[in-house]
């Protein structure tokens, strides 16, 4: 008995209010007077007073229009008490379901939607999705069921039905072929969302479809023929700037040019790079060109893009005729660095070598020569023939000017061109050793005790090279052999000097003659300080004083 089925109340009721909904009735009213009340949100708690019950009659009343989008269902409890306040029934659940009216239009989530699609795509390609919401119910009614449609397309090129929209999902897709960014870079679609699954209220928004660039246009040379003039021998020289036009999106990989020399550069003399801003091809010399060898080059340059073409496109080729301009080139010594072996100490006026230069130019130019750098002043050079002769003594052992037996001279060749040009060569004289130095002992001063003297070992040096050095031989002269002995060691590179008789403390000259393997003899005087002492000594002790 004490049960009420769920009560359905349409939202936005026009009233009049209070409006009767249902009558609560307990069968206990046969026995006693019953008073009714309701509790719950919408009755005695917020939102208060939306519903009321007449205490004596049990009539449940609605006091105001309902809004399903605010509250879709009210859960109240009905109570029945007797006159003395005692509960005569358990609280009864009263469900009030607010039924939907189509009182909301769809609303797009954005005023403007933005999407993009690659030009040239096939029909069926998805572009973007638009969304509209409707606060009305879409489960039990169609009030909130939104259907999407495209109202208009601008521009209408190539025709007015380039796109379609899925009526339920709002997915915009390409429906026709012919999207061409170079003709229409952007479409503006006026889109509609209509509730009642397409039969109700409509709202509009804008969908902007950007057509993205595909590499469907080849870069084209403009012009296709070029003539350029380049001085010979110039490296890194800008020969020509090649200009291309490309209808694809500027500064994109589909627009940026890539240049390739297809022919005419057998010697790999040229290189081509792309200018980052202008997109021009900058043709430069990688190596110097030689007018005398080839005075004209015809290059064939092909242009493509950084991005691959999306369809088969003819590539554009440019022809560049490069005229090489003659330049007065410097004479070149042959070889640039010349090594000549010459004996040291050759007589003055003796020829050393002939060192000449060749002029790359075709004209028979006169070349004159001179020495540019001759640190020791040992040489002269004939200005006409390039003959180098000795004017000083070539000394291999001169450590100031000679390094590792090599004496370096720089020579100059000058042509009679206008203006004249010069070239330099390096003459490396390898000086052959002559036995022009005798052996020398080191040290040349010794200190020795006159009692139990220690043998003095002297090193032998010779500025010459082998075989004009060791083994050395030693001999004492001028009566030095009375008191001294001199012996060369087994290796033949040291001499041992010994005191063989007592000498009183004093300083003596020991005359020592050393000869090398080539019998070059050198007399050296050794200053010997003899001390009154035993064995080893470095300096003579002072006189002894008793006390």
């Amino acid at each position: 008995d004490w049960v009420v089925a769920p009560i359905s109340v349409p939202e936005n009721g026009k009233g009049p209010f209070p409006q009767r909904l249902n009558q609560l009735k307990s069968n206990k009213d046969r026995d006693t007077k019953i008073f009714y009340s309701i509790t719950g949100p919408g009755a005695d708690s917020p939102p208060e007073g939306v519903f009321a019950v007449e205490k004596e009659t049990g009539w449940l009343l609605l006091n105001k229009p309902l809004d399903r989008e605010e509250i879709a269902k009210y859960e109240l409890f009905g109570h029945a008490v007797s006159e003395n306040g005692a509960s005569v029934e358990d609280p009864m659940n009263i469900s009030i379901i607010v039924t939907d009216q189509n009182d909301h239009k769809p609303k797009f989530t954005q005023d403007t939607f933005r999407g993009s699609v690659l030009e040239g795509v096939l029909p069926g390609t998805s572009v973007m999705q638009v969304t509209a919401t409707d606060e009305d119910d879409a489960i039990y009614t169609y009030n909130g069921v939104v259907a999407y449609s495209i109202h208009s397309q601008e521009p209408k090129d190539p025709h007015d039905l380039m796109f379609t929209i899925h009526r339920s999902t709002g997915t915009i897709s390409v429906i026709s072929s012919g999207l061409d960014r170079e003709k229409v870079p952007e479409y503006t679609l006026t889109i509609q969302a209509t509730d009642m699954d397409g039969d109700g209220s409509t709202t509009t928004a804008v969908a902007v479809v950007e057509i993205l660039d595909a590499n469907d246009n080849a870069p084209m040379f403009d012009p296709q023929k070029y003539e350029a003039h380049v001085p010979e021998n110039a490296v890194g020289h800008e020969v020509q700037r090649l200009t291309v036009t490309d209808l694809d999106a500027p500064n994109s990989p589909a627009w940026r040019a890539t240049y390739l020399i297809m022919g005419g550069d057998d010697g790999d003399h040229f290189t081509i790079t792309t200018h980052p801003e202008s997109n021009q091809g900058i043709l430069t010399t990688r190596k110097g060109l030689d007018f005398e060898a080839k005075n004209q080059h015809t290059l064939y340059v092909e242009v493509t893009n950084e991005a691959p073409f999306v369809l088969k496109l003819p590539t554009s080729t440019a022809t560049i005729v490069v005229h090489v301009e003659d330049v007065n080139e410097a004479p070149v010594f042959v070889p640039p660095s010349k090594v000549v072996e010459v004996q040291e100490g050759i007589p003055t006026g003796e020829p050393v070598c002939v060192y000449t230069a060749e002029d790359p130019d075709k004209e028979n130019q006169k070349i004159s020569y001179r020495i540019l750098r001759d640190p020791a002043g040992w040489l002269a050079m004939d200005p006409d023939s390039g003959q180098v002769t000795a004017v000083g003594t070539l000394d291999r052992e001169d450590e100031q000017f000679v390094r590792n037996n090599i004496y370096e001279v720089m020579v100059l060749a000058m042509d009679n061109g206008s203006p004249p040009t010069t070239g330099t060569g390096t003459l490396l004289l390898t000086l052959i050793d002559v036995n022009d130095h005798g052996p020398v002992p080191e040290p040349r001063q010794i200190t020795i005790c006159n009692q139990s003297p220690v043998r003095q070992v002297l090193n032998i040096t010779d500025k010459d090279l082998s075989p004009h050095t060791s083994p050395f031989q030693a001999q004492l002269t001028d009566d030095s052999d009375i008191y001294w002995t001199a012996e060369v060691n087994e290796e033949g590179d040291t001499v041992v000097l010994s005191l063989k008789k007592f000498l009183k403390q004093d300083t003596y000259d020991v005359h020592l003659s050393l000869s090398d393997h080539g019998n070059k003899e050198q007399l050296t005087v050794i200053r010997a300080t003899v001390c009154d002492c035993h064995g080893h000594v470095e300096t003579c002790p002072g006189p002894w004083k008793g006390g």
Epitope: P16, F17, A52, E54, E56, N63
Partner: antibody, heavy 119, light 107 residues
Framework: EVQLVEESGGDLVKPGGSLKLSCAAS????????MSWVRQTPDKRLEWVAT????????YYPDSVKGRFTISRDNAKNTLYLQMSSLKSEDTAMYYC???????????WGQGTTVTVSS | ELQMTQSPSSLSASLGERVSLTCRAS??????LNWLQQKPDGTIKRLIY???SLDSGVPKRFSGSRSGSDYSLTISSLESEDFGDYYC?????????FGAGTKLEIK
Amino acid sequence: EVQLVEESGGDLVKPGGSLKLSCAASGFTFSTYGMSWVRQTPDKRLEWVATISSGGHYSYYPDSVKGRFTISRDNAKNTLYLQMSSLKSEDTAMYYCASYYYGSPFAYWGQGTTVTVSS
Amino acid sequence: ELQMTQSPSSLSASLGERVSLTCRASQDIGSSLNWLQQKPDGTIKRLIYDTSSLDSGVPKRFSGSRSGSDYSLTISSLESEDFGDYYCVQYGSSPLTFGAGTKLEIK
């Protein structure tokens, strides 16, 4: 049990003036019933003036009085009120208060109070 | 707004006679119609609510009925205390509107 309602506050008032009517209720649980004001013009026609919900949260008016009249209630005092302002000569009438009962309006009526709007 | 057309505007009848008063609604109001009685002293009482439900204390000779948009109050046998003015009032549409009244007099 006998339900009684009794109006008071009727008076002679000049056009543009204001007046507040009261209605005292007894014999029923006033706070659980919707209440209305109804007026009877001199030509005997009845016209609904205002309704208020039992808790006093919601009120309704016809266009003829909207913005000029305000219905209110004090459930603690079992009293209904009608505040009238910007009065016009066509507001001259006998004013009755009436209760809802069985969810239906105009169940129990008072004896009425006279309002005369005249210069 | 919804119009209630009440007829007749006046009626003379004899005691014991059966009389019917009618109200016609200009729009659908369902069963949301009451009948009121106003005595010569001005007191008003509700006789019938919801087209046909009798208020407590109202004699059973009073009855209400509906036929489409026509609503009737019938007094099966007139008694002396039944004379006065009768009004219908609808509460199925806002604003609530009353009939112009029927004056019931003794013949």
